[in-house]
């Protein structure tokens, strides 16, 4: 009893603590983290005895978005959508979750992060993982061979998420493909400047796109001497190097993979190698690694996508890594990641990448696995993580203190008397019908400062204001909430005024 | 029963570093709060550092800000200070602390203490 | 920072005594305060949170009280166990500052 009256009292206190800091216009970073400790005190508090023991909160991995994050979220979205259309892409859609068996071996080790449904109608469903398998799926049952498609929806992983990282176990992947028998490299290069036009659009810093290829990783570890059943395995090993050192990542091919270490070592002399095409065009000297096929195939192709990229100026954005070797089974060719940039601590150090932020690369045998006769559509595609980038532009915008407003209202009808209230349910009638985004206080007789107030905080920018003398008068006095100036305005002209001033087309066409 | 057991102090050189651990039993560490707080010899206490549940939030006094580093590994109930150009007044019985409440600036439970000797 | 100030530095007494040590700080910091006790070679004991809640296992005869700038702690009736020192510390805002300890002797 004791314990739960310290723990009242630490929340009253706490709570008092959050109300000054506020009052204060504390940093924002502050102010959160003293809410967030007030939500923890909280919750260690309980449901009082009276009420219900249930805790009410989100699954594990899981949120809501607030109208401020949709806000964000919406933002991100519309640059994202309108680099894809510019690039002529059509959009699908596909279920949320598939037969069980249309995910079962395509993500190898992963594969234990499919979300399986309790179903009782007799099917064995599982929720879908990403969305590069559903569009593989959606190709072969439609015997379609060629399509530019765009698809943005939310997937499913069974992870124990860094949430603060923005990770999730319910998240958005925003896809680009390209499908069909093309020239060699010019898909793979448009998916790159899309890639680098949505990361440069956001500007949520610095970026580079590692790129590297599943063929030349392959025949690196077959001249490496790595066996065939090894592949996958110190793939995994090597794709870490850019979190840990590569003493570490040998350790773990040695120690826990069984590698010997003069393989280890043949293959640390490749992975820790990044350029441009000069790399290369240096590999494609290499004595051993232009032996293999394989491996040649792929440099061959990484030159000619060097050249395109250098055709779409963005070679400055793109380095070949070695040690590129992202997880999903079903690469075939390039692949490519890109990462954020943290401004190195002193010049002439390396900069520091600080997570991916968009992936993807080649697949061209992931549609065959659906089709009775194995027919193959090489694919091409991209993935954009934008719960991370969600998560840097919320926090920058807070950094930053900016107000993002959550409505998109250009108009308050307000009044200046009381019983007016019929006139301003006609004049915002008038207003949505002319296709003018309008509010009004749902009060008969609202203070005029408590609506002016109301404007202030929902970020309007104009108040239509009705009085009796300008009933009267066949006019409405338009007010701008930050200037506060004040025109009448006749009333057949208002939807004009107010479309001029906000920049809106002057017919909703 | 709730036990923090610090470990890596020593003697160093001045400009040298050293690696303080925690190690933690008997409570869920992931929910807490952690801190960091040194007592010179003879002297009173003073609050170095503290890094919240998840790791979002780390603060420093200022003598150590840009010296020291707190984190913290909840998968293996953890927590460190990496402490780099290590001066003379860094001399002190370093002790690893839990909040009071899981957030409660207020040390509830302390190890045993770990002495750091910084001299030439 | 906030300073936090006790006084006495040092006080001798006998078994049985009741003690009082106070604490003032340098800005009002509501009731984030809390009283230590320290031991030689030991680690700190919490024994009063937010001025005046006793940590579970202290014994009643410690209280604390106050408000704003002006704690104390108080001992009813000194046992030979509680010969240490105290320390208040502040838990209002970063950096949470300890004041500088009040010696209890025996007389």
């Known amino acids: 009893m004791a314990e739960r009256a310290a723990l009242e009292e630490l929340v009253k206190l706490q709570g008092e603590r959050v109300r000054g800091l506020k009052q204060q216009k504390a940093s924002a970073e502050l102010i959160e983290e003293e809410v967030a400790k007030l939500l923890k005190l909280k919750a260690q508090l309980g449901p009082d005895e009276s009420k219900q023991k249930f805790v009410l909160k989100t699954p594990k991995g899981t949120r809501d978005y607030s109208p401020r994050q949709m806000a964000v979220r919406e933002k991100v979205f519309d640059v994202i959508i309108r680099c894809f259309k510019r690039h002529g892409a059509e959009v699908i859609d596909t279920p949320v979750f598939e037969l069980k068996e249309t995910l079962m071996g395509k993500y190898g080790e992963d594969s234990k992060l499919i979300y399986d449904l309790k179903d009782q109608g007799g099917e064995l469903l599982s929720l879908r993982y990403d969305l590069t398998v559903p569009f593989a799926r959606y190709l072969a049952m439609n015997k379609l061979t060629n399509i530019k498609r765009y698809h943005i929806a939310k997937v499913y992983r069974r992870d124990n998420p860094a949430m603060t990282r923005g990770r999730y176990r319910e998240f958005y992947q925003c896809d680009f493909d390209i499908a069909g028998n093309f020239d060699p490299m010019i898909p793979d290069a448009e998916c790159l400047k899309i890639m680098c036009e949505i990361l440069s659009s956001l500007q949520i810093g610095d970026f580079l796109v590692k790129v590297n290829d599943r063929r030349i990783l392959d025949g690196m570890f077959a001249i490496c001497g790595v066996s065939d059943s090894k592949f996958r395995t110190i793939c995994s090993s090597v794709d870490k190097l850019d979190k840990v050192s590569w003493e570490e990542v040998k350790n773990e091919m040695v120690g826990e993979k069984g590698l010997a270490p003069e393989v280890a070592d043949r293959i640390g002399d490749y992975v820790q190698q990044h350029g441009g095409v000069s790399l290369v065009e240096q590999l494609l000297q290499d004595p051993k690694l232009s032996q293999n096929k394989q491996a040649l195939e792929g440099l061959g192709d990484l030159k000619l996508l060097f050249e395109y990229l250098t055709l779409f100026g963005i070679d400055d954005k793109i380095s070949f890594d070695l040690s590129l070797a992202r997880g999903l089974d079903y690469y075939t060719g390039v692949i490519y990641e890109a990462v954020l940039l943290q401004t190195p601590a002193q010049a002439g150090e390396e900069p520091l990448g600080v997570g991916s932020v968009a992936a993807g690369g080649r697949y061209d045998g992931l549609v065959g696995m659906f089709d009775p006769k194995g027919r193959k559509v090489p694919c091409v595609g991209l993935s954009i993580g934008v719960e991370r980038i969600f998560s840097i532009v919320e926090q920058r915008l807070e950094a930053l203190e900016e107000k993002i407003r959550t409505t998109e209202t250009q108009v308050l009808v307000a009044s200046a008397q009381k019983k007016l209230l019929e006139e301003r349910l006609k004049l915002v009638s008038e207003l949505w019908d002319a296709g003018i985004k309008a509010e009004l206080l749902y009060k008969k007789n609202p203070k005029l400062l408590n609506q002016l107030q109301y404007c202030e905080e929902a970020g309007i920018p104009l108040v239509a204001i009705i009085g009796e003398q300008e009933l009267k008068d066949g006019v409405i006095k338009l007010r701008s909430v930050t200037s506060r100036e004040e025109v009448d305005v006749r009333r057949e002209d208002l939807v004009e005024e107010i479309k001029r001033r906000t920049g809106q087309p002057l017919c909703i066409c | 029963q709730v036990q923090l057991v610090e470990s890596g102090g020593g003697l160093v050189k001045p400009g040298g570093s050293l690696r303080l651990s925690c190690a933690a039993s008997?409570?869920?560490?992931?929910?807490?709060?952690m801190s960091w707080i040194r007592q010179a010899p003879g002297k009173g206490l003073e609050w170095v550092s503290y890094?919240?549940?998840?790791?979002?939030?780390?603060k420093y006094t200022d003598s150590v800000r840009g010296r020291f580093t707190i984190s913290r590994d909840n998968a293996k109930n953890s927590l460190y200070l990496q402490m780099n150009s290590l001066r003379a007044e860094d001399t002190a019985v370093y002790y690893c602390?839990?909040?009071?409440?899981?957030?409660?600036?207020?040390?509830?439970?302390w190890g045993q203490g770990t002495l750091v000797t910084v001299s030439s | 920072d906030i300073q936090m100030t006790q006084s006495p530095s040092s006080v001798s007494a006998s078994v049985g005594d009741r003690v009082t040590i106070t604490c003032r700080a340098s800005?009002?910091?509501?009731?984030?305060l809390a009283w230590f006790q320290q031991k030689p070679g030991k680690a700190p004991k919490l024994l009063i949170f937010?001025?005046?809640n006793l940590e579970s296992g202290v014994p009643s005869r410690f209280s604390g009280s106050g408000s704003g700038t002006d704690f104390t702690l108080t001992i009813s009736s000194l046992q030979p166990e509680d010969f240490a020192t105290y320390y208040c510390?502040?838990?209002?805002?970063?950096?949470?500052?300890f004041g500088q300890g009040t010696k209890l002797e025996i007389k």
């Open positions: 602390a839990r909040y009071l409440y899981q957030v409660i600036a207020i040390a509830d439970a």
């Open positions: 800005q009002g910091i509501s009731s984030w």
């Open positions: 008997g409570f869920t560490f992931s929910d807490y709060y």
């Open positions: 510390q502040q838990a209002e805002s970063f950096p949470y500052t």
């Open positions: 937010v001025a005046s």
């Open positions: 890094i919240s549940d998840k790791s979002r939030y780390t």
